[in-house]
C-alpha cells in the first residue's frame, strides 16, 4: 500500500475544555499536499502545503491550527460530540481518510454539583 492513516478512533473531552484532533499519515513514497478536517459534512479547516491554513469562519474562534497537521478544538460543547474526519490528499498516492469519534462529557464540576443536588 502507498500509505496508511493512524488515529485514535474514540476520544473524549470535557465540556468547556479543549481537545487535539490528530491523524498521522505514513508512506514511503507519497507526500501530503493537503489535509481537510470535517465535522460530519461541515468543513472545519484545511491545511495546504502551498497555501497554508484555512479555518472555516464558523469555527474561527474555537479552532486553532496544530499541532502539526492536526487541530486544537477549544471551548467544547455537548453539541460537538460526533464524528470528525481527516482527509489526506497525497501525491502520488491519492486520498486517505481517517475517522475520530469525539465524545464531549459534562465537566466533572457539573457532575459533582448534580450529585450533591440530588
Amino acid at each position: 500500500t502507498a500509505g496508511t492513516i493512524d488515529t485514535k478512533r474514540n476520544i473524549s473531552a470535557e465540556e468547556g475544555g479543549s481537545v487535539i484532533l490528530q491523524c498521522h499519515f505514513s508512506s514511503d513514497t507519497a507526500e501530503v499536499t493537503q489535509v481537510d478536517w470535517k465535522q460530519q459534512d461541515q468543513l472545519l479547516a484545511i491545511y495546504s502545503v502551498d497555501l497554508g491554513w484555512h479555518v472555516a469562519s464558523v469555527f474561527s474562534d474555537r479552532v486553532v491550527p496544530g499541532p502539526s497537521l492536526g487541530l486544537t478544538f477549544q471551548s467544547l460543547t455537548m453539541n460537538d460530540t460526533g464524528e470528525y474526519f481527516c482527509t489526506y490528499h497525497t501525491y502520488p498516492g491519492g486520498i486517505y481518510k481517517g475517522r475520530i469519534f469525539l465524545k464531549v462529557q459534562e465537566s466533572s464540576d457539573d457532575r459533582n454539583g448534580l450529585a450533591q443536588f440530588q
Epitope: 499536499t33 493537503q34 484545511i46 497555501l51 497554508g52 491554513w53 484555512h54 496544530g66 490528499h89 501525491y91
Partner: antibody
Framework: EVQLVESGGGLVQPGGSLRLSCAAS????????MNWVRQAPGKGLEWVSY???????NYADSVKGRFTISRDNAKNSLYLQMNSLRAEDTAVYYC???????????????WGQGTMVTVSS | DIVMTQSPDSLAVSLGERATINCKSS????????????LAWYQQKPGQPPKLLIY???TRESGVPDRFSGSGSGTDFTLTISSLQAEDVAVYYC????????FGGGTKVEIK
C-alpha cells in the same frame, strides 16, 4: 522564457458569466501549482483560487460557489470559470505560479500581465 | 483571515537614501515545525504585474538586487531598500501564507 498570458476578460453584466484562460510556456506546467489573484482598480491584491499540480482545488470565501478553477496540462493552460458575477468582481485577474524550488515558500514567483474583467450594467 | 497592515501608505525618499516599509500581521506567521516565517514581499510598477522580491521573510528571490532586504519574525516585518534607485519607484506589498494568502494594502515609494 517563462511566461504566463491571460485572456478572456471583458465587460459583462451583473449575474453574467466569463471564462478566463492562462497560457503557460517556458516551464513544465504540469509540475506547478497555479493560482488566480485579482486586483480591483486602484486597490490591493486578493488571492482568488488555487489548483495544485495533482488537482487539489481551493477558493477564497468571496468566490466560493461562483468560480471554478481548472487546468489542462496537455494544453499548458489554466482556466477560471466565473459565474453569477457581481460589481465587486471587477478587477484585473492575474494567473500566478507557485514557487516550488527548495521547499514550498508559498510565494508566487511568476505572474501574467493580467486580463481586465468589468462587471457593470 | 490574517489581516496584513502596511505602513506607511506612501513614502518619499531621496535617491541613494534608505527606504523602510513595515508590515504587521494580526497573527504570527511563524510556522513552528520548520521555523519559517511565511511572509513574502512584492514590487509592482505601474501597469505591470507584481514581482516577487523576498520570501520566508528574508530570502531574496533569484535576480533581485541585494539592496532589497527583508527582516522580522512572528508578526512584525520590514522591507528595506538600502539605497533607493529611480527604478525602485513602485508599490510594495507584503503577503502572508501561514493561512490562505492575504496581502497588505501596499506602500507607494516615490522619489523625493
Amino acid at each position: 522564457e517563462v511566461q504566463l498570458v491571460e485572456s478572456g476578460g471583458g465587460l459583462v453584466q451583473p449575474g453574467g458569466s466569463l471564462r478566463l484562460s492562462c497560457a503557460a510556456s517556458g516551464f513544465t506546467f504540469s509540475s506547478y501549482s497555479m493560482n488566480w489573484v485579482r486586483q480591483a482598480p486602484g486597490k490591493g491584491l486578493e488571492w482568488v483560487s488555487y489548483i495544485s499540480s495533482s488537482g487539489t482545488i481551493n477558493y477564497a470565501d468571496s468566490v466560493k460557489g461562483r468560480f471554478t478553477i481548472s487546468r489542462d496540462n496537455a494544453k499548458n493552460s489554466l482556466y477560471l470559470q466565473m459565474n453569477s458575477l457581481r460589481a465587486e468582481d471587477t478587477a484585473v485577474y492575474y494567473c500566478a505560479r507557485h514557487r516550488i524550488a527548495d521547499s514550498p515558500s508559498r510565494a508566487f514567483d511568476i505572474w501574467g500581465q493580467g486580463t481586465m474583467v468589468t462587471v457593470s450594467s | 483571515d490574517i489581516v496584513m497592515t502596511q505602513s506607511p501608505d506612501s513614502l518619499a525618499v531621496s535617491l541613494g537614501e534608505r527606504a523602510t516599509i513595515n508590515c504587521k500581521s494580526s497573527q504570527s506567521v511563524l510556522f513552528s515545525s520548520n521555523n519559517k516565517n511565511y511572509l513574502a514581499w512584492y514590487q509592482q510598477k505601474p501597469g505591470q504585474p507584481p514581482k516577487l522580491l523576498i520570501y520566508w521573510a528574508s530570502t531574496r528571490e533569484s535576480g533581485v538586487p541585494d539592496r532589497f532586504s527583508g527582516s522580522g519574525s512572528g508578526t512584525d516585518f520590514t522591507l528595506t531598500i538600502s539605497s533607493l534607485q529611480a527604478e525602485d519607484v513602485a508599490v510594495y506589498y507584503c503577503q502572508q501564507s501561514y493561512f490562505f494568502p492575504t496581502f497588505g494594502g501596499g506602500t507607494k515609494v516615490e522619489i523625493k
